[in-house]
């Protein structure tokens, strides 16, 4: 199967968690942190124009 | 701003369903990115699925991909979790979220109080 996208980190991402429990075998969850589902699920909403409305916040 | 109430809850066997409800009070909900978070007991709180304001872009962690769906109503100011396939593993506190912009970063910054599932084996 192929890797799903927020699967893996990205370095400009900054903190971030491996969805894949796997991938993190040392354990480094933090409060602080975010899974790379959520980050990649907010950095997409952020960059598409149907994700979030303008003026939002 | 948005306030978040979580609904639908409860015990039920491994591989049944469960249906997450999350009602928004305000008029601004549709201008909101919508989550559904999870944690279970001893564990740190877990991304499940997401949700673009207008319900068409959806998101979803390895673990639930195929078996949990989020959708939204806008005109009811409601955000679904439709849970099939249910496994012990599943058993959290289940949260909805709303997600703001500040300065260019999204984050999830509006939590509901959270509704218990529990997956029993």
């Known amino acids: 199967l192929p890797t799903l996208p927020w699967s893996v980190c990205q370095e400009e991402w900054g903190d971030c968690l491996p969805s894949d429990p796997d991938l993190d075998p040392v354990g480094t969850i933090t409060n602080e942190t975010k899974s790379s589902a959520e980050l990649y699920f907010l950095k997409t909403v952020l960059q598409q124009k149907d994700g979030i409305e303008d003026g939002l916040g | 701003q948005v306030q978040l109430q979580e609904s639908g809850g409860g015990l039920v066997q491994a591989g049944g369903s469960l249906r997450l409800s999350c009602a928004a009070s305000?008029?601004?909900?549709?201008?909101?990115?919508m989550g559904w978070f999870r944690q279970a007991l001893g564990k740190e709180r877990e991304f499940v699925a997401g949700i673009n304001w207008s319900g068409s872009m959806t998101y979803y962690a390895d673990s639930v991909k195929g078996r949990f769906t989020i959708s939204r109503d806008n005109a009811k100011n409601m955000l679904y979790l439709q849970m099939n396939s249910l496994k012990s593993e599943d058993t959290a506190v289940y949260y909805c979220?709303?997600?703001?912009?500040?300065?260019?970063?999204?984050?999830?910054?509006?939590w509901g109080q959270g509704t218990q599932v529990t997956v029993s084996s």
């Open positions: 305000g008029r601004t909900f549709s201008r909101y990115a």
């Open positions: 979220a709303g997600v703001t912009v500040v300065g260019g970063a999204p984050a999830f910054d509006y």
